[in-house]
Structure formats: structure tokens, C-alpha cells
């Protein structure tokens, strides 16, 4: 039996032929461990590796730290890759990271990144950003430095408060920060003036709940 | 040492395009965005817009509404600079220039600058 | 946009004096983050271009005289050149670096008296 082929990101997949958007299958090299992940392979040259979607409310994104570590959702719809394997993958190369956002206007955004990483679980998934770029604002949305990934049941934020809890979603909080892609979703007519929705703060302010979200990486020598 | 050279003086008819170069030599061309500036003459500055050669991102004055294009080329570390429908107002000297980022989402500056390149336009 | 507004338009100073300039933005430049001010000052003379002299509003750049402060935060910012060398008379320009378009004032231009 021939050696099973293995990718560990979109972008290897990309590579060896396969050009049509959907789930593939990502294993990371010297691993067994694989996951389900959805492939963009029309945006901007292909090879985007989606880490995050929002787009409907399907999924309830107040999830436990072992959930978003492993992952949860549909990759075809709303979920969350995983910080585990995210964290590993991007500690191997450098990878940029695209956030793409949509409001209830139709209008969309996006905020770039020239180099992105996680670190690991023993640090808290704590986020690296370098580089910005994009028309979602100037300065990040994610606070800078990066801070350690907070949960309902894991508190690292540096607010007295619990962030995670107060504004629901698990996510790189400040005190508790100018984004929460992973806050509540709620539908049209109802997302504004909502604290603990969807936010990215340059882009549409404090109290505007997104349409929708996807986050997206991929090698930076693509 | 870093350099930023940039291509000769142009002159373009108006309604016509002009493409100006920018090649980096002294470090990592993916590491710093390129900024490109202008001044017209007796003018000040104004921003026309920045790429990040890594991804080939970019982010740009809305005030030239679609006439601008940047553009990098990591193979040859040279980044580019097109406008489009060129105007008389549109004769300036255009520069770019590096600018630092770094993990903990402080400002840099822009630290280094090419020479200029002087575009006029004229019938 | 953000607009910035730079006074004097020019400042006559002699060779050894304290230079102020100002520069005012129409919306804060702090960061919501770090509570930094995104305001950077460049120098100019005649036929060169700019020379970054502050970021950060208060940070100089490295190699630039200790006589150049910069100080402020939010709207309202200051360049001093405490004891003016000949080589310091120049156009300066202050910059927006919180949001899009990145705007400059529209120059100091300091002389001699």
C-alpha cells in the first residue's frame, strides 16, 4: 500500500493540486492527530486554512478551554479549529493571518497581519501579531501586546472582571479589549448597542454585532 | 546598510499612467512595510498609501479612489508604485519609505526614504 | 479623515534658543490598547527627503540629537529643540498614524532670525 499523503495546512493542499474550496483533512508532521478544516482556495491565491467562522448563530461559541483547544463546530458552517493544533502549526513556519468581517450593511473588511502565532497551551494560547495592514482599521483590534486566550472556565484576561463570562466567547482579551470575534451573534436589527456581541472595534465601534466573521491563515512564503 | 533606490523622474501625458520602483537593499524586504508619500511642489506631504511585500497587503488613500495600485515583488525586494489617470495636480516628487512593525503594535515611523522621484505632468 | 494642524506656520528663532513647535489633531490619537499616541515628527529641507526625528510621540529615533523632545498625547502635541544648531532650520511635519489616510500637518517652517 502506497504512503497516505498528508497535509498540514490548505496551503500544502493548494500545492498538490486540490483547488476547490471545501473541508480537507490536516495533519501536522511527526502526528497522528487530525483535523477537519475548511479550505478557501479562491480567495486571494488560495491556500487559506479558516480557523474561525461566524455567519448565522448555529454554533454557541460559549465554549469550555478544552473545546476551543481541540475545536468544535462544522467546518462547512461556524466553528473554531482549535487552539492546539493552530498553535503548533504556526510555530513550525511563519504564517499570516487575514480576519475578514462583514456588517449588516453589506459592507466588508478586513485586517491583515504580517506574521501571526500562538503560543502554547502551557502559556495560555497567548497570540503574537506583527504588521497590519487592511481596511478594518488602522490600529488592531486585537490588543497589542498580545494577551493569553481566556475562557467561561479560564480566566487569564487582566480585567477584575471575567471577560469571557461577562462578554461570552473565548478569546484573547485585554481588559477586556476592542474585539471578541466569538461574542454572541445576534440577527439584524438587533446588533446594535450590544456589549457582548460580535465586535471589532475599529472597524464599526464598541456596541456593533457583526454579520459575519472568518479567520484565516497561511504561510507567509505562499 | 539600508537603501531604498527608486526609479528616474518621468514625464506622462495627462489621462496616461506612471509606474514608479522602489528597490530595498540592507535588509529583510518581508519585514517592513513600504509606505509611498508625495509632495507636490512648494507642497506638503500626503500619503498615498502602503504594502506589506510579505503578503502583498495593502492599504490606500481612498482620496485617489482606485487610481493607485502598490505592489511589491519579493523575488527582486522591489516594491512599485502606479497611478493612473494621471492629472496636471498630479505632478509631484513621490517617495517611498520603510516603515518598522513589530509585536507589541507600537508606531515606528517611517525611518528610511528613497530619493524621490519627480513626475510631471504636462500636455 | 483626521486633520492636522501645525503652528506656528513659520517660527523665527535664533542659533542657541529653545524652538516649540505645535501640532493638533482633529480626534485622539491614542491607542485604546496601549495608550500610546500614533503621532510621529519628520524633518525636511530643501531637495532631501523627510528625516524621522520622533515616534510615539515622545520616542526619538535613533542617531537624532538629544536636543529633540517630543511630548503630548491625544490631541495636542509639542517638538522642542532646546538649543537650535544650524543645521536644525528645516520644515517639520507632524503625522497621523491612528487611522486611515495617514495625514501630515501642513509644515512648521523653522528659520533663522
Known amino acids: 500500500k502506497g504512503e497516505q499523503i498528508s497535509f498540514r495546512d490548505c496551503a500544502e493542499v493548494f500545492k498538490s493540486g486540490h483547488t476547490t474550496n471545501g473541508v480537507y483533512t490536516l495533519t501536522l508532521p511527526n502526528s497522528t492527530e487530525e483535523v477537519k478544516a475548511y479550505c478557501d482556495m479562491e480567495a486571494g491565491g488560495g491556500g487559506w486554512t479558516i480557523i474561525q467562522r461566524r455567519e448565522d448563530g448555529s454554533v454557541d461559541f460559549q465554549r469550555t478551554w478544552k473545546e476551543y483547544k481541540v475545536g468544535f463546530g462544522n467546518p462547512s458552517g461556524e466553528y473554531w479549529l482549535g487552539n492546539e493544533f493552530v498553535s503548533q502549526l504556526t510555530n513550525q513556519q511563519r504564517y499570516v493571518l487575514k480576519i475578514h468581517l462583514k456588517d449588516w450593511e453589506g459592507n466588508e473588511a478586513y485586517s491583515l497581519y504580517e506574521h501571526f502565532y500562538l503560543s502554547s497551551e502551557e502559556l495560555n494560547y497567548r497570540i503574537h501579531l506583527k504588521g497590519l495592514t487592511g481596511t478594518a482599521g488602522k490600529i488592531s483590534s486585537i490588543s497589542q501586546p498580545g494577551n493569553d486566550f481566556s475562557t467561561k472556565d479560564a480566566d487569564n484576561d487582566k480585567c477584575i472582571c471575567k471577560c469571557s463570562q461577562m462578554l461570552t466567547g473565548g478569546w484573547w482579551f485585554d481588559a477586556c479589549g476592542p474585539s471578541n470575534l466569538n461574542g454572541m451573534y445576534y440577527p439584524q436589527r438587533q446588533n446594535t448597542n450590544k456589549f457582548n456581541g460580535i465586535k471589532w472595534y475599529y472597524w464599526k465601534g464598541s456596541g456593533y454585532s457583526l454579520k459575519g466573521t472568518t479567520m484565516m491563515i497561511r504561510p507567509a512564503g505562499f | 546598510q539600508v537603501q531604498l533606490v527608486q526609479s528616474g523622474a518621468e514625464v506622462k501625458k495627462p489621462g496616461s499612467s506612471v509606474k514608479v520602483s522602489c528597490k530595498a537593499s540592507g535588509y529583510i524586504f518581508i519585514d517592513y512595510f513600504i509606505n509611498w508619500v508625495r509632495q507636490a511642489p512648494g507642497q506638503g506631504l500626503e500619503w498615498m498609501g502602503k504594502?506589506?511585500?510579505?503578503?502583498?497587503?495593502?492599504s490606500s488613500n481612498e482620496k485617489f479612489k482606485g487610481r493607485v495600485t502598490i505592489t511589491a515583488d519579493k523575488s527582486t525586494s522591489t516594491a512599485y508604485m502606479e497611478l493612473s489617470s494621471l492629472r496636471s495636480e498630479d505632478t509631484a516628487v513621490y517617495y517611498c519609505?520603510?516603515?518598522?512593525?513589530?509585536?507589541?503594535?507600537?508606531?515606528?515611523?517611517?525611518?528610511?526614504w528613497g530619493q524621490g522621484t519627480l513626475v510631471t505632468v504636462s500636455s | 479623515e483626521i486633520v492636522m494642524t501645525q503652528s506656528p506656520a513659520t517660527l523665527s528663532v535664533s542659533p542657541g534658543e529653545r524652538a516649540t513647535l505645535s501640532c493638533k489633531s482633529s480626534?485622539?490619537?491614542?491607542?485604546?490598547?496601549?495608550?500610546?499616541?500614533?503621532l510621529a515628527w519628520y524633518q525636511q529641507k530643501p531637495g532631501q527627503a523627510p528625516r524621522l526625528l520622533i515616534y510615539g510621540a515622545s520616542t526619538r529615533e535613533s542617531g537624532i540629537p538629544a536636543r529633540f523632545s517630543g511630548s503630548g498625547s491625544g490631541t495636542e502635541f509639542t517638538l522642542t529643540i532646546s538649543s537650535l544648531q544650524s543645521e536644525d532650520f528645516a520644515v517639520y511635519y507632524c503625522q497621523n498614524d491612528h487611522s486611515y489616510p495617514i495625514t501630515f500637518g501642513q509644515g512648521t517652517k523653522l528659520e533663522i532670525k
Open positions: 480626534q485622539s490619537l491614542l491607542s485604546s490598547g496601549n495608550q500610546k499616541s500614533f
Open positions: 519609505a520603510r516603515e518598522a512593525f513589530d509585536y507589541d503594535g507600537d508606531y515606528y515611523g517611517m525611518a528610511y
Open positions: 504594502i506589506g511585500p510579505g503578503s502583498g497587503s495593502s
